[in-house]
């Protein structure tokens, strides 16, 4: 008799999930020699332990603590780049500006980037058919709780000037419901963080508006100021030129506004 299986609204666990996590861990330690003390088998066991045999709507930050401990990593606290709805450009930037870090440049972020996973209550099986959707099913699912946990820790670690890249093409440039808006903003430590500098990335070629005046940016400024952190904002009118100038700052065309 086929066992009844909960059907969730979201996509199932990414295929080859265990192999991918393990391979990513090994790759990360190969290219980041300072993390070679990490035992990737233990990392996978801790990752698995956070969600296997647990109801996928009943996951807590506590479930991820063993993994958090194994993945403890020191990044320069004044070199943190947060992002919201513009991941690819943020990653292209840290790929060029090697001394800055997004969450996905850390071991735990690198392990889980773009993956989906969940288990089932009381069985050791991984559910490859479906996983809970944050909106339609539940917010305390394995993926959402993981990102909430690592994002909180990443924001808590930040100091001095923290940068955030925001997507100027979206209707809500700053979205209170994004991970940045709901987790990271509220976990920046005012005693350590002096300024949050937003970079608003323009999408259109001819878009010369000052998106730093957008109502949602003003809302972000208000939230940040209330937390005793200074706020500044820059328009990045030409993201392609911006990246090019990060690569080649001495280029003569890089003195003008980008």
């Amino acid at each position: 008799v086929p066992r009844w299986r909960q059907q969730w609204s979201g996509p199932g666990t990414t295929k080859r999930f265990p192999e991918t996590v393990l391979a990513r861990c090994v790759k990360y330690t190969e290219i980041h020699p300072e993390m070679r003390h990490v035992d990737c088998q233990s990392v996978w066991d801790a990752f698995k332990g956070a969600f296997i045999s647990k109801h996928p709507c009943n996951i807590t930050e506590e479930d991820y603590q063993p993994l958090m401990k194994l993945g403890t990593q020191t990044v320069p606290c004044n070199k943190i780049l947060l992002w919201s709805r513009i991941k690819d450009l943020a990653h292209q930037f840290t790929q060029v500006q090697r001394d800055m870090f997004t969450l996905e440049d850390t071991l735990l972020g690198y392990l889980a980037d773009d993956l989906t996973w969940c288990g089932e209550f009381n069985t050791s099986k991984i559910n490859y058919q479906s996983c809970p959707d944050w909106r339609k099913d539940c917010s305390n699912n394995p993926v959402s709780v993981f990102w909430k946990t690592v994002s909180r820790r990443f924001a808590e670690a930040a100091c001095d000037v923290v940068h955030v890249m925001l997507n100027g093409s979206r209707s809500k440039i700053f979205d209170k419901n994004s991970t940045f808006g709901s987790v990271e903003v509220h976990n920046l430590q005012p005693e350590k963080v002096q300024t949050l500098e937003a970079w608003v990335i323009h999408g259109g070629r001819e878009d010369s508006r000052d998106l730093c005046q957008d109502p949602t940016i003003k809302e972000l400024e208000s939230i940040i100021s209330k937390r005793n952190i200074q706020f500044s904002c820059k328009n990045i009118y030409r993201p392609d030129k911006f990246l090019q100038c990060v690569k080649n700052p001495e280029d003569s065309s890089c003195t003008s506004e980008i």
Partner: antibody, heavy 123, light 112 residues
């Protein structure tokens, strides 16, 4: 079995570019970092850079930073190394290479190598 | 960058006799994980390099037990207990403790 097969020998003019390919088979291409190493005639081995084929992220030796571009085509399980502004000193054998994994740890040594691609730069 | 220095640069050996190659690094290659990131390769004439030893003393798959690696944080030795004709080629040490990985200048082993 695991194999890295590289493109054929190239003869290039000074100032031009060359693009060498390395086709991987016998393993999941995105699970391993791919490195590039070169060897000028009668000289020692020289590491040029790596690519993570899954993410496309790269890192290059300072010496080649401005002239080398390593890319990967996941659908073809192939890595590429392009070297621009060629000079006579770039005449060398170019290799792609990857580590082995020993019980979930990268061995730290290049256990698998392509057969090499000879690039000759002439004026 | 870490500098790797090999000696001798040329090593003529009689078959059946032992051989020893030295390698020095400008910094310790001992990682906090307890492993020493020193590798040895053999490049036979006309071939790609092949990994012989990794982590200073661990033989790679399929490497005969006549090859052994030893050393401390900065001084390393590759020993061949009894040289065979097929062992001719250039031997390279390499550090992989940090980027960029760097190689020694090579030791050419030839049969007397």
């Amino acid at each position: 079995q695991m194999q890295l097969v590289q493109s054929g020998a190239e003869v290039k003019k000074t100032g031009s570019s060359v693009k060498v390919s390395c086709k991987a088979s016998g393993y999941t291409f995105t699970d391993y970092i791919m490195h590039w190493v070169r060897q000028a005639p009668g000289q020692a081995l020289e590491w040029m850079g790596w690519i993570d084929p899954e993410y496309g992220s790269t890192d290059y030796a300072q010496k080649f930073q401005d002239r080398v571009t390593i890319t990967a085509d996941r659908s073809m399980s192939t890595a590429y190394m392009e070297l621009s502004s060629l000079r006579s000193e770039d005449t060398a054998m170019y290799y792609c290479a990857r580590v082995a994994i020993i019980t979930t740890v990268a061995s730290g040594g290049f256990a698998y190598w392509g057969q090499g691609t000879l690039v000759t730069v002439s004026s | 960058d870490i500098v790797m220095t090999q000696s001798p640069l040329s090593l003529p050996v009689t078959p059946g006799e032992p051989a020893s190659i030295s390698c020095q690094s400008s910094e310790s290659l001992l990682h906090s994980n307890g492993k020493t990131y020193l590798n040895w390769y053999l490049q036979k004439p006309g071939q790609s390099p092949q990994l012989l030893i990794y982590w200073m003393s661990t033989r790679a798959a399929g490497v005969p037990d006549r090859f052994s690696g030893s050393g401390s944080g900065t001084d390393f030795t590759l020993k061949i207990s009894r040289v065979e004709a097929e062992d001719v080629g250039v031997y390279y040490c390499q550090q992989f403790l940090e980027y960029p990985p760097t190689f020694g200048q090579g030791t050419k082993l030839e049969i007397k």
